[in-house]
Amino acid sequence: PASLAGCYSAPRRAPLWTCLLLCAALRTLLASPSNEVNLLDSRTVMGDLGWIAFPKNGWEEIGEVDENYAPIHTYQVCKVMEQNQNNWLLTSWISNEGASRIFIELKFTLRDCNSLPGGLGTCKETFNMYYFESDDQNGRNIKENQYIKIDTIAADESFTELDLGDRVMKLNTEVRDVGPLSKKGFYLAFQDVGACIALVSVRVYYKKCPSVVRHLAVFPDTITGADSSQLLEVSGSCVNHSVTDEPPKMHCSAEGEWLVPIGKCMCKAGYEEKNGTCQVCRPGFFKASPHIQSCGKCPPHSYTHEEASTSCVCEKDYFRRESDPPTMACTRPPSAPRNAISNVNETSVFLEWIPPADTGGRKDVSYYIACKKCNSHAGVCEECGGHVRYLPRQSGLKNTSVMMVDLLAHTNYTFEIEAVNGVSDLSPGARQYVSVNVTTNQAAPSPVTNVKKGKIAKNSISLSWQEPDRPNGIILEYEIKYFEKDQETSYTIIKSKETTITAEGLKPASVYVFQIRARTAAGYGVFSRRFEFETTPVFAASSDQSQIP
């Protein structure tokens, strides 16, 4: 029979072209891509492959070794001169490892029939590949009808005698896929029908989408689907110290490529992304939320000595409101307002000042006015009370001026203008205010209310009274108006610097009406209500000291 090389050599001995071919093949052995998982690679099997040839004089194994003395498993057949060839080569059982679609990569050489003398009628340039699924590792048989044909394999490049002479080896690589597979494993079979072939390597593999970390989500090794157009949706799991709003998913294509990412993971508060992992924020740095990209330095006047901080601690005497974001500097209450001036207009006071030198680092500075009424003699002050009105308001003032109205006249007041901000209520420290002392102008006094009768005689009446409740200044004198009852048009006026008088020249047993008013530098107040007193009869004893209600 014709040998593969077209030259005759001893039986079972590898012809020259095989040696040349194998040397070339060995130099080009490449590692499989990361998305391919080998189920069988004849090049890497160290011992016997355990394949069966049927009939025995068909396919034959050529025993060669590489430079490391590892066996090279090559099968050849070249019965081109004989008719009706039906030579089978069966692999051992191959586990599919859960894959439902597998790939078979064949590396082989094929002799050009035209380059062979004679045998043109019987020489073929193709061979067939079959498979048979089985759960049983010992289920190998050679019932041809049980094997399912995968394809007829033809060479893209066939070689001639001339190629041998030039030492040019034309190694063909053909890949076919099979699926869907439903059993644990399968056998492959190669059928020769009269070609001159050397099967240099058989690699069976499935494709997977290799485990990957994308957007801080770990996607596991995923075996591709059975359908060549199928996309498998795969859920990812967030890496340590990361969280997600939208669970991460990706799609594994039939080619073993990850496509169409959905969702992502984010490093949780206190951690930041570095090299695809979530690293702890170191002391002095913080991250308040997963949605923030990286750890940031503590803002001014704050610190953290912890790892994985989500906020920083305010320094002594500095504060943070609950509503302040953790990225905002810690702040403190403002210093006192400055350069306060007052302007008194009768019973109104206008105050003006300039803002504090130190706002405490905040923009929400406002002012509060505390009003105190002071007794100039005792030096004691008390709250002003509710009768005072503040324009525009007493607290929460944004402008640096305020007007107080409805004050008491001729009264000493102390106004405390306090600067406050958003953290003033958090600070245990002393209030920061500037004081202004003012005295309101004098005004006409209020009416005299409390009048007592003194000695009453037949021709005179003695009266005493108390200063008005609101003198509104220094009482310069009192004016007493009196007349006989029902004789209002004929009245008498007496002036007194004291709070007592005696009206004389009165008729006995007559009723007299008295009204009293006080005067300050601002003028007279209104007269008091009418007080009625009666002189005694001619012969009666005089009365004394009874109070008129």
């Epitope: 002391p283 330095k297 000595h305 912890e306």
Partner: antibody, heavy 120, light 111 residues
Framework: EVQLVESGGGLVQPGGSLKLSCAAS????????IHWVRQAPGKGLEWVAS????????YYADSVKGRFTISRDNSKNTLYLQMNSLRAEDTAVYYC?????????????WGQGTLVTVSS | DIVMTQSPDSLAVSLGERATINCKAS??????????MNWYQQKPGKAPKLLIY???NLESGIPDRFSGSGSGTDFTLTISRLEPEDAAVYYC?????????FGQGTKLEIK
């Protein structure tokens, strides 16, 4: 006023144990990292251990790892250093020091130190 | 561990003169644009005192004749006009990574 006061030092035999304390006052103890630093007689400073305010982060020098334990009781404003399997080379003045608040932090307040002598 | 090496081991400088102490780290002590380098002063029988933090920041209450400079692995402490009370041992310390290592110290004497 910030104050750190160490106590618990003394003479101990090799292989023995000792527990140092550091009483803190004048600051919010629970928010501050505190360190132990030691100084052998006539030698330089050697950092020993540190603990964060919430005790979540603890570090030791290789020379004391497995033998010394740093801890704190924030309710008592006190830091501790439990020293076991003491060796002659552990003889030193032990200082506690507060991690500062100005970034990047240094050790801004130190105690007066307590002397530990390991000798037979 | 990061090894801190100070130079010189000791120096004597006249009053009013400038004193310079160097510190070299076996690897960079910088992180995110800041240098984690501190300088301390220690007088006999006393606890160390922080002078400079973050390579160049003067600690509160320290006279401004003290200054620090440098980044990465090379740092310098400078005392611009030496005063009698500046006689002490000076230590550099890195706080970039655990363990926080100190230099061996430099003894400064008044000439």
């Amino acid at each position: 006023e910030v104050q750190l006061v160490e106590s618990g030092g003394g003479l101990v035999q090799p292989g023995g144990s000792l527990k140092l304390s550091c009483a803190a006052s004048g600051f919010t103890f629970s928010t501050f990292g505190i360190h132990w630093v030691r100084q052998a007689p006539g030698k330089g400073l050697e950092w020993v251990a540190s603990i964060s305010g919430a005790s979540t982060t603890i570090y030791y020098a290789d020379s004391v790892k497995g033998r010394f334990t740093i801890s704190r009781d924030n309710s008592k404003n006190t830091l501790y250093l439990q020293m076991n399997s003491l060796r002659a080379e552990d003889t030193a003045v032990y200082y506690c020091a507060r991690y500062g608040t100005s970034f990047p932090y240094g050790l801004d307040y130190w105690g007066q130190g307590t002397l530990v002598t390991v000798s037979s | 561990d990061i090894v801190m090496t100070q130079s010189p081991d000791s120096l004597a400088v006249s009053l009013g003169e400038r004193a310079t102490i160097n510190c070299k780290a076996s690897q960079s002590v910088d992180y995110d644009g800041d240098s984690y380098m501190n300088w301390y002063q220690q007088k006999p029988g006393k606890a160390p005192k922080l002078l400079i933090y973050g390579a160049s920041n003067l600690e509160s209450g320290i006279p401004d004749r003290f200054s620090g400079s440098g980044s990465g692995t090379d740092f310098t402490l400078t005392i611009s006009r030496l005063e009698p009370e500046d006689a002490a041992v000076y230590y550099c310390q890195q706080s970039n990574e655990d363990p926080f290592t100190f230099g061996q110290g430099t003894k400064l004497e008044i000439k």
